[in-house]
């Protein structure tokens, strides 16, 4: 049975050229986190695997860092990065558990006088 | 052109353990992850794990977490081990090793060059 | 664990003719998944990778499609040195799963 659950950093804003932590935590269960995969739309970004370590996708390498813990941070963004983010966190025994962030990407000015989505 | 040679055909019995090699030529050793499969007589492939020779990192199917074992000789640089004990009759099967096709990475990694394969029997 | 059932367990076709076969994951694994082929005795042997991408020296009849949960191996006019089994699998989450394999063999 999944007893577990995503907390998330929900819908969040950031600047254009400014960068981002994406975070997510598995809470309520004591299932053995294996793999998270972080993935936007249908894109795989990043695999953390607990025995191995990260994987970055060649495509996003100078863009994405990896961490802080199993979250990651997105650099140099642009409005192209606005979107749907998931975290995929492969468990044992438990299965598959899956967040959703939205980010929003702003232009500078618009940034500065308010964001639609503030961070937790 | 790359080559996976694996060692010979093993009999065992029930709570020994086996070590299979398998040595590797053709290309950077250190730069390919390697896998290893198994296929019990009659039945389709099973992963049972992955070993990065150029760190020793290795990450094992839950089934056989415990029992398996993976290592790479240090000194030559050419060859990778996989030890399963604690065996029992289950355990007959075909052991393959298998390259990971992308350098320096575990993904996307798809099983480019396959040895030959190594039959281990536990009567 | 990501589970890949594979159907039909045994597909019987002459030769010449067509062969489909089929590939479901337990759930998505986008188009991260690879084809094999293994004969009697021998070692599987690479065919397509990233679900349609055929490896260095596969012929063209072997064709590969789908994306995310259903995948189909295409070969377009056995030859009789396409009678073989024939494994998909997944490679973005550990542990790397198989399917129980598809066997073609002749009519």
């Known amino acids: 049975m999944m007893t577990g659950t995503i907390e998330t950093t929900g819908n969040i804003s950031a600047e254009k050229g400014g960068s981002i932590i994406l975070q997510c935590h598995l809470s309520s269960t004591t299932a053995q986190v294996t793999q998270v995969n972080w993935e936007q739309q249908d894109q795989l970004l990043a695999i953390c695997n607990a025995d191995l370590g990260w994987h970055i996708s060649p495509s996003f390498k100078d863009r994405v860092a990896p961490g802080p813990g199993l979250g990651l941070t997105l650099q140099s963004l642009t409005v192209n990065d606005t979107g749907e983010y998931f975290c995929i966190y492969h468990t044992y025994p438990d299965g598959t558990y899956t967040g959703r962030i939205f980010l929003e990407v702003l232009e500078s000015s618009v940034a500065e006088h308010g964001a639609r989505f503030q961070i937790p | 052109q790359v080559q996976l040679v694996q060692s010979g055909a093993e009999v065992k019995k029930p709570g020994a353990s086996v070590k299979v090699s398998c040595k590797a030529s053709g290309y950077t050793f250190t730069s390919h992850y390697m896998g290893w499969v198994r296929q019990a007589p009659g039945q389709g492939l099973e992963w049972m794990g992955v070993?990065?020779?150029?760190?020793?990192?290795?990450?094992y199917a839950q089934k056989f977490q415990g029992r398996v074992t993976m290592t790479r000789d240090t000194s030559t640089l050419s060859t990778v081990y996989m030890e399963l004990s604690s065996l029992r009759s289950e355990d007959t099967a075909v052991y393959y090793c298998a390259r990971l096709h992308v350098s320096g990475s575990y993904y996307p990694a798809y099983l480019d060059y396959w040895g030959q394969g190594t039959m281990v029997t536990v009567s | 664990e990501i589970v890949m059932t594979q159907s039909p367990a045994t597909l019987s076709v002459s030769p010449g003719e067509r062969a489909t076969l089929s590939c479901r994951a337990s759930?998505?694994?986008?188009?991260?998944l690879a084809w094999y082929q293994q004969k009697p005795g021998q070692a599987p042997r690479h065919l397509i990778y990233g679900a349609s991408t055929r490896a260095t020296g596969i012929p063209a009849r072997f064709s590969g499609s789908g994306s995310g949960t259903e995948f189909t191996l295409t070969i377009s006019s056995l030859q009789s040195e396409d009678f073989a089994v024939y494994y998909c699998?997944?490679?973005?989450?550990?542990?790397?799963?198989f399917g129980g394999g598809t066997k073609v063999e002749i009519k």
């Open positions: 759930q998505s694994v986008s188009s991260n």
């Open positions: 699998q997944q490679y973005i989450v550990f542990p790397w799963t």
């Open positions: 070993i990065n020779p150029s760190m020793g990192a290795t990450s």
